[in-house]
Amino acid sequence: LTCLGGFASPGPVPPSTALRELIEELVNITQNQKAPLCNGSMVWSINLTAGMYCAALESLINVSGCSAIEKTQRMLSGFCPHKVSAGQFSSLHVRDTKIEVAQFVKDLLLHLKKLFREGQFN
């Protein structure tokens, strides 16, 4: 996926098609959720403004064996300009709060939808 600079985001912002597809995947996850997502696994909360895509991937990549978010992990890896591996925390986010994966996905979705509606993908 091509990553383009956003209007107000320091990190890379994907073009509209890629962003919309990520939003759709996150919506699918939240709407199809029956049992606790990823068995209630906890991940680091991230800063949703700076280096968001890499930070989100760095947080989620530490969840293993959860097929529900594998596609999201793959999509986020396309948005992040550097390779991310488990245990890596180089992007701008504060490791002081852990939240459930389900809440992480909801927060990320809300923010991405706002970016999309504002047109922040060019």
Partner: antibody, heavy 123, light 107 residues
């Protein structure tokens, strides 16, 4: 039951500012994923999207008219407003407001429409 | 802007007929295609969104299909109340754009 109703001046002169009101019921613009659009149709021409406003006050405009358009809302009174500055005879049209489909996805589909209000620009 | 073209500005059909109305986009709109019905009294209703999803309360005789740049609306068993003008609209990118409409008439 969702309803929307447009109101406007009916007739105005060139160079004046057109002010339109969309009064709605059956939903709230304080609810997540809710939005309202304005569309117009000049006689014998295609429908033209003008602008929309979302529950969180995100606004988008048709680039062709952006410099003349202002959209706003009053959530408490369930109204959305559109102002079109420096009107000309080409702005003569039926103006509609419509609600954006509310779901997790962003379809940009309009599920409920007002009946439209006719606006004539004439000197 | 994405141009939406409905080649048939009018169609004539008999009650009970299967009617297909087509719509073409100037570029791939990734199934973000919506169909509307405008009755002679000016009432506009959403029929189909995202190519093939039926809006609530819309009779099942209406269906939509297509992909890429070519889309269609089908009415399987034309009824008198279906006499109206039908518009397509792309929701892939802003500005939202509409087709010119296809007016459906009874033979």
């Amino acid at each position: 039951q969702v309803t929307l109703k447009e109101s406007g001046p009916g007739i105005l002169q060139p160079s004046q500012t057109l002010s339109l009101t969309c009064s709605f019921s059956g939903f709230s613009l304080s609810t997540s994923d809710m939005g309202v659009d304005w569309i117009r149709q000049p006689s014998g021409k295609d429908l033209e999207w003008l602008a929309h406003i979302w529950w969180d006050d995100v606004k988008r405009y048709n680039p062709a008219l952006k410099s003349r358009l202002t959209i706003s809302k009053d959530t408490s009174s369930s109204q959305v407003f559109l102002m079109l500055a420096s009107v000309d005879t080409a702005d003569t049209a039926t103006y509609y407001c419509a609600r954006i489909v509310s779901s997790g996805y962003i379809y940009y589909a309009l599920d409920y429409w007002g009946q439209g209000t006719s606006v004539t620009v004439s000197s | 802007d994405i141009q939406m073209t409905q080649t048939a500005s009018s169609l004539s059909a008999s009650l009970g007929d299967r009617v297909t109305i087509s719509c073409r986009a100037s570029q791939d709109i990734r199934n973000y295609l919506n169909w509307y019905q405008r009755k002679p009294d000016g009432t506009v209703k959403l029929l189909i969104y995202y190519t093939s999803r039926l809006h609530s309360g819309v009779p099942s005789r209406f269906s939509g299909s297509g992909s890429g740049t070519d889309y269609s609306l089908t009415i399987s068993n034309l009824e008198q109340e279906d006499i109206a003008t039908y518009f397509c609209q792309q929701g892939n990118t802003l500005p939202l754009t509409f087709g010119g409409g296809t007016k459906l008439e009874i033979k």
